[in-house]
């Protein structure tokens, strides 16, 4: 009982004057509170509270549920308590079966005893199963059994409070421990697509997925550099214990160009925060941009292959592609494919495969592509490099020797004189006249060159060589002639092709 100091308010006194009282079930509980400023008795057990304004608390026939703490309070707010155990062999425990534990914290299994003199007050697993090896607990007959430092692994653990009574083990009703997980990592956030490209008026919708151990994770969509509240829709579900998922869907029903920008999905819990962004680009209309992967002027040797390759950006996606040459459309020899299989891909590749090109196949090759908004085209000028071909080699009536050669690039014609029977024609002869003629073939075809020399300059028997050459190769033609007295015999031309 409290000691009284004169002049100071003192706590009330209780009879019987002990901290604990044990009564048998069915017996009377009689508690007297003595204090000039008596206010009330309060009874507490588990979550139950009762009050009594009489200074004497009387329970005529005590029951196990009358076990608990009886507190008398005076007008000064000072109090004194006595704990009463109502011993009932048929009801050794009072129980509140709700059992929650915050991860890493202690939690109380609320199974206070009605008889403090039983032994081995402890916890046991249900159906004879052992408790987890690392589970530690502290029993308190007036409150229950405190589990120390709850682990996530204890979630849904089934257990009983247990005592030994007269050599036998007695179990309480079962408890199921619900563990509230602590946040030990930031939320996991992901976005349905990292970038979006839309035309004005189209709907923009993007979904952020937030995963965490519980639904108390916070999440929101934010527009970078803006405080405007965005329209979000949510769905959520539990994939099992400590595995919660939320989907936050952001929608702009009719996107405008000024909606373009970066949108951030932000999530946080007590451990920290995480975010992921998506970029929206809204264009007023679709577009196609073509990028040649090779020079648009192409030189290729006769008989060789060449690939005309373009990359192009198309939004919306391309609907028609074609390659054209001389107003004819290729039905094969080309392929068109997306640059990547990514859902956001707007880049494509088109390749035209030209094989064993002939000199007559030079010209303009055009790639055309269109989508629902625009058309675009790009032209390649293809030049086929051909070795010179000597078209004519004649002695004209005016005594001129004339050589006409065709090839690409434009051939150069050189003249040489070989005296007598020598094989090597080394002495060069300057032409009297050189002309580039217009070809009757298509542009980009062979170029024709005509060169003439005056045969009267030759005074000895011999051979005249007309040599036509360019970057690809060379070809020669020969004029043989002999003198009979002062007259030249008929010239016999022949050609020798030199690769």
């Amino acid at each position: 009982q409290p000691s009284v100091s004169p002049g100071e308010p003192s706590p009330p006194s209780i009879h019987p004057g002990k901290s604990d009282l044990i009564v048998r079930v069915g017996d009377e509980i009689r508690l007297l509170c003595t204090d000039p400023g008596f206010v009330k008795w309060t009874f507490e057990i588990l979550d139950e509270t009762n009050e009594n304004k009489q200074n004497e608390w009387i329970t005529e026939k005590a029951e196990a549920t009358n076990t608990g703490k009886y507190t008398c309070t005076n007008k000064h707010g000072l109090s004194n308590s006595i704990y009463v155990f109502v011993r009932d062999p048929a009801k050794l425990f009072l129980v509140d079966r709700s059992l929650y534990g915050k991860e890493d914290n202690d939690t109380l299994v609320r199974c206070p005893l009605t008889d403090p003199e039983v032994t081995n007050y402890s916890l046991k697993g249900c159906q004879g199963k052992p408790l987890p090896k690392d589970l530690r607990f502290i029993p308190d007959p007036k409150a229950g059994i405190m589990i120390k430092s709850v682990k996530r692994a204890y979630h849904r653990l089934c257990l009983h409070c247990s005592v030994d009574q007269e050599g036998k083990s007695v179990l309480s009703e079962k408890f199921i421990l619900k563990v509230r997980p602590a946040f030990k990592a930031v939320p996991v956030v992901s976005v349905s697509k990292a970038s979006y490209l839309l035309r004005e008026g189209e709907e923009f919708t993007v979904t952020c997925t937030i995963k965490d151990v519980s639904s108390s994770v916070y999440s929101t969509w934010k527009r970078e550099n803006s405080q405007t509240k965005l329209q979000e829709k949510y769905n959520s579900w539990h994939h099992g214990d400590f595995n919660y998922e939320r989907q936050a869907t952001l929608t702009i029903s009719s996107a405008r160009v000024n909606d373009s920008g970066v949108f951030m999905c932000y999530a946080n819990n007590t451990f920290g925060s995480a975010n992921v962004t998506t970029t929206l680009e809204v264009v007023d209309k679709g577009f196609i941009n073509i990028f040649p992967m090779i020079n648009t002027t192409v030189f290729v040797n006769d008989g060789e292959n060449v690939d005309l390759i373009v990359e192009y950006e198309a939004f919306p996606k391309p609907e028609h592609q074609q390659w054209i040459y001389m107003n004819r459309t290729f039905t094969d020899k080309w392929e068109d494919y997306p640059k990547s299989e990514n859902e956001s891909n707007i880049r494509y590749v088109s390749e035209l495969h030209l094989t064993r090109l002939k000199g007559t196949e030079g010209g303009t090759y055009t790639f055309l592509v269109s989508n629902s908004d625009v058309n675009a085209a790009i032209a390649f000028n293809v030049y086929v490099n051909t070795k010179p071909e000597i078209l004519t080699y004649d002695r004209l009536v005016n005594g001129m020797l004339q050589c006409v050669a065709a090839g690409f690039p434009e051939p150069t014609i050189d003249w040489y004189f070989c005296p007598g029977t020598e094989q090597r024609c080394s002495a060069s002869v300057l032409p009297v006249d050189v002309q580039t003629l217009n070809s009757s073939g298509p542009p980009f075809g062979k170029l024709v060159v005509q060169s003439s020399i005056d045969s009267s300059a030759f005074k000895h028997n011999g051979t005249v060589e007309c040599k036509a050459y360019n970057d690809v190769g060379k070809t020669s033609a020969y004029f043989n002639f002999a003198f009979k007295g002062n007259n030249k015999e008929q010239i016999h031309p022949h050609t020798l092709f030199t690769p």
Epitope: S219, S236, A248
Partner: antibody
Framework: EVQLLESGGGLVQPGGSLRLSCAAS????????MSWVRQAPGKGLEWVSA????????YYADSVKGRFTISRDNSKNTLYLQMNSLRAEDTAVYYC????????????WGQGTLVTVSS | DIQMTQSPSSLSASVGDRVTITCRAS??????LNWYQQKPGKAPKLLIY???TLQRGVPSRFSGSGSGTDFTLTISSLQPEDFATYYC?????????FGGGTKVEIK
Amino acid sequence: EVQLLESGGGLVQPGGSLRLSCAASGFTFSDYPMSWVRQAPGKGLEWVSAIGGSGGDTYYADSVKGRFTISRDNSKNTLYLQMNSLRAEDTAVYYCARGAYDGEGFDYWGQGTLVTVSS
Amino acid sequence: DIQMTQSPSSLSASVGDRVTITCRASQTISGYLNWYQQKPGKAPKLLIYDASTLQRGVPSRFSGSGSGTDFTLTISSLQPEDFATYYCQQNYRTPFTFGGGTKVEIK
């Protein structure tokens, strides 16, 4: 002691609007998700909408999506339901309910407020 | 959306009877099922959450079982105060949905 008290119900014409409030006490309001559940006369329970403890995440039944808006003011311990474009089939007693921890049901309910949509 | 189907829609029983109500989900809901009791003119009251955990203050004659799609609410010995309508409800994913209810009447 946990208490939830709804208000704002009444008679409204089709197409009209109404705002329900739910005043909460006896617990840390911002720690709990909250829901609105309705019950048409003589019918079963229908979940209407829910909101997370912070007010960040909101959820709706398909039948009210786009017409109803749930919100909360944690500084005032109050939950709201703004109901627009009301229809006759929205006539019901509207209950405010506290969401227990993840998936553990609605552990406390208000007494309900009657909304009647009729011309 | 997940549909919840309760059966029977109503039943008559006497005090002391064992009563069983079933609830089936249209897709798996793990153990995220709750049971409520509602008396005329009153708000519903949570009886069982997580399929089998008794809410604080609910008598132990009520019990719940099941997982996945099939769930059961059992009243081991019906008491006069148990005559009411019982609802199941899934909290597995939004939108949350209730069963149609089972009315338990006095025989």
